[in-house]
């Protein structure tokens, strides 16, 4: 049933009223306001922005708006001792140094407190040695180097190009390979789209542009010093040596002008194939070390960054529900940026601001949502999702009992081609139905629905006439809500054409050139894509908070469970002999999925037919829907990843950004042919199959008739 049936709604105050109140011009104005100075986590400027947002959300009409603070480990460059990398000759003289900061964009030359490019949480150090080029530093790249090419990275400084996987995974892989330092660089092959000018004349990365970013491997822990618990005044803090997820070797990022100087001298082995070659005019030799004439030259890193416990601030706004105030729908996105945050995060924060304003307008006219809506402006997302994780740790007991859904709101755009949605299967039908009601902003789709343009441009690989919806991975603030707490989650933004633009992220990601002008001149001059994203995010929140029956369809979970079971079975079947030898069977898992499918189908029939006017029955059915996601949580967590507790989805162990299905089984099977003890390895596969089977069956039983 539609949200207009909620008892507290007058015909005037429906979804249409909420959507009609959203204005592109306001989003534009908010984005400009949020991007004039840097808002780095832990700085005074970001605290002042938090207070401004608190004040404005109150003006917009929220019931309460509070700042919540935590004292977490952050990382900054040393102001008087800059980080850089040198080429040194045999006498130890520096004959080339990488740049100390990015050339500032026009109009921003006199802005203070622009943090220079650095890899957050890099330890200090001055390693020197020969260079090895490791492509993207993915698991498979190190397999190629070590196993096929017999190149040893031990004691070497590795240079890796950004892209394909989360930078923290690159650093972890380099550490495991024995490297003494890591240089990360942006190759034009990945960050310079052909036919587009570099900033300020276009949206491509100039040669001096550099991607900042953290290099942690937190696996969902939050603040490295207080895993599992909020970093409050009485928190016990680990020592730095026991902190979670910190890298052990120095790391530093550079642009492609500087990378050219390092890579042009490379000698040693040739690159294995074209997939290892970027677009610079260099040979892309792997090394180790420089070629003949330069063989006595070495590379030296100079890293002096410091990690320090610093106060951060979330802004939490509440719009109390009229009927079910103890049921929470959360819309959250971060506020902290690396520099100006033109796209990341302020294109998202501006949308959240306008959504709050629209909800506030309705509330001032006497309306309330059925359920409570919480709005969050998270701090320190760029330093490891810290603000959201600490808040969720502090409020975990409330969230696990009352959390209906979490909608994420980081960058609204990463392109201007079509919609991109990642969410729990429970939200598929909500997203389909909503996008059918929204107008497409795309050229050539005037008067057509967003669903239609999205489906045309990003078709589902499995179902014709439907758009693609991806799995949730991580790398953003939904992580703690979905992967740790099991709260149904989703995210939406406008994206690029992945067919024609194969670069990773958008070229100016986390650089000084991510400005208001980048968005206004090149990505969304009319702010129509921002408005569409506001309608999708806001519309999802409206429906989740206002529908009499929660807009979750458990049958869609049944469909994907079967797909994921098929996929993991096919991976295992690449080892038929071992499966036979060790009696590995997926029969139990397929049986559990079948049971889930049948029970979900019956539940959906009951959901359709039950008496919606009976408040006890209604609450009971809604609770079964709300708690279904929770039922996929294993309290023991995944092996070596205690804060990743969702049995169906986890961030890939090889790329934090990507989602993996049946991750416990997947990781047990990964590279199993190389394990020294195959009996133990296949035993672990069997254990993981049993955990997955139990979890799917247990989740199914939560949908059974209660008595």
């Amino acid at each position: 049933k539609s949200s207009s049936e909620a008892t507290n709604i007058t015909p005037k105050h429906n979804m249409k009223a909420f959507l009609d109140e959203l204005k592109a011009e306001n989003i534009k104005k908010f984005l400009h306001n949020f991007t004039q100075i840097p808002h780095l986590a832990g700085t005074e400027q970001n605290f002042q922005l938090a207070k401004q947002i608190q004040s404005q959300w109150k003006e917009f009409g929220l019931d309460s708006v509070e700042l919540t603070h935590y004292d977490v480990l952050l990382s900054y460059p040393n102001k008087t001792h800059p980080n850089y990398i040198s080429i040194i000759n045999e006498d130890g003289n520096e004959i080339f140094n990488t740049s100390l900061f990015e050339p500032p964009p026009a109009g921003y030359e006199n802005v203070s407190d622009i943090v220079p490019p650095f890899s957050a949480f890099s330890p200090q150090g001055m390693p020197e040695g020969d260079l090895v080029y490791v492509n993207y530093a993915r698991t498979e790249d190190f397999f190629k180097l070590e196993r096929d090419m017999k190149i040893n990275c031990s004691g070497k400084i590795v240079i890796a190009r950004y892209g394909k996987v989360f930078r923290g995974n690159k650093v972890k892989n380099a550490q495991l390979a024995g490297a003494t330092g890591v240089i990360l660089y942006s190759d034009p092959a990945d960050y310079f789209a052909p036919g587009v000018k570099s900033y300020p004349d276009g949206w491509n990365l100039p040669g001096g542009g550099v991607q900042r970013g953290n290099i942690l491997n937190l696996n969902g822990a939050g603040d490295p010093l207080t895993p599992g618990y909020p970093a409050n005044e009485y928190a016990y803090r680990r020592g730095i040596a026991e902190a979670v997820g910190l890298p052990s070797i120095p790391v530093h990022p550079i642009g492609y002008y500087d990378a050219q100087k390092l890579l042009e001298k490379m000698g040693g082995s040739a690159s294995p194939d074209s997939s290892w070659r970027g677009s610079l005019k260099v040979p892309y030799n792997v090394g180790p070390g420089f070629t003949g004439n330069f063989s006595t030259q070495k590379v030296k890193m100079h890293i002096h960054s410091t990690s320090e416990v610093t106060r951060i601030y979330n802004v939490i706004g509440t719009l109390r529900g009229a009927v079910e105030p103890d049921r929470y729908v959360i819309l959250g996105g971060h506020r902290d940026s690396w520099v100006f945050g033109g796209i990341d995060p302020q294109s998202g924060a501006a949308v959240v601001h306008e959504i709050v304003r629209s909800f506030g307008t309705l509330k001032k006219e006497g309306w309330r949502p059925r359920r409570t809506i919480l709005f969050a402006s998270w701090d320190a997302e760029e330093f490891g999702l810290l603000g959201s994780t600490e808040w969720a740790e502090e409020n975990s007991r409330l969230l696990q009992e009352r959390g209906v859904a979490y909608i994420n709101a980081d960058s609204s755009i990463e392109g201007n081609y079509t919609l991109r949605v990642d969410c729990t299967p429970l939200m598929y039908s909500l997203v389909y139905n909503l996008t059918k009601e929204l107008e497409s902003p795309d050229e050539g789709f005037e008067g057509k629905s967003l669903y239609e343009s999205w489906t045309k441009k990003s078709p589902s690989p499995e179902f014709s006439g439907m758009p693609r919806i991806s799995k949730l991975g991580s790398g953003n603030d939904f992580e703690v809500f979905f992967q740790r707490l099991g709260i149904a989650s989703g995210r939406a933004r406008y994206t690029k054409n992945w067919e024609t633009n194969k670069f990773s992220s958008y070229p100016l990601y986390h650089s000084v050139y991510e400005t208001y002008e980048l968005v206004e001149k090149f990505y969304d001059p009319m702010f129509k894509y921002h408005l569409t994203v506001a309608q999708v995010r806001g519309g999802m929140v409206f429906e989740l908070a206002n529908s009499v029956v929660l807009p979750f369809d458990c049958r869609d979970y049944a469909v994907v469970l079967r797909k994921y079971a098929d996929k993991i079975y096919n991976i295992s079947m690449k080892h038929p002999q071992e499966m036979k030898t060790y009696s590995v069977s997926f029969d139990s898992l397929f049986s559990a999925v079948k049971n889930f499918t049948e029970i979900a189908s019956k539940f959906s029939e009951r959901l359709r037919d039950f008496d919606k006017s009976n408040p006890i029955l209604l609450r009971m059915m809604n609770d079964q829907l709300m708690f279904l996601e929770r039922a996929f949580i294993d309290p023991l967590g995944l092996p070596d990843r205690p804060f990743y507790r969702h049995v169906i989805y986890a961030p890939s162990s090889h790329n934090k950004y990507a989602g993996e299905s049946f991750p416990g089984i997947y990781d047990a099977l990964f590279d199993i042919e190389s394990k020294v003890d195959p009996s133990q390895a296949w035993g672990e596969v069997k254990r993981q199959i049993s955990i997955a089977t139990f979890t799917v069956q247990a989740a199914a039983e939560t949908l059974s008739e209660v008595a």
Epitope: Y84, F96, N97, T98, S99, L100, F101, P103, P104, P105, A106, E109, N110, S198, Y199, P200, P206, G207, G208, Y257, Q260
Partner: nanobody, 126 residues
Framework: EVQLVESGGGLVKPGGSLRLSCAAS????????MYWVRQAPGKGLEWVAV????????NYADSVKGRFTISRDNSKNTLFLQMNSLRVEDTAVYYC???????????????????RGQGTMVTVSS
Amino acid sequence: EVQLVESGGGLVKPGGSLRLSCAASGFNLISYGMYWVRQAPGKGLEWVAVISYDGSNKNYADSVKGRFTISRDNSKNTLFLQMNSLRVEDTAVYYCAKGGNALYSSGWPDDGFDIRGQGTMVTVSS
């Protein structure tokens, strides 16, 4: 209007020192690689030193290496050349020159320069 104004030249004995300054206006120094070049009486223009936009890289002509130091203060929009152990052959008009915008070029000597100042005369004589 883009302007470069050099100062600090003068008469100095061999072995002496001078510090040249170059005040930039009409553009932000922070975005540009910067050069010192010189022209001895009756000779062509000779490149002396270059500094990248951020000061991370400095290159010198072999004839001045170890004696001259180029530096910059981006906050004051000023370029400097510290000249020690001066020799008679260092006598020349010294010009500061603006390199390519670092947003469009790497700021290395082979990028070349576009605008230079009026120059300041340095005379090394006993």
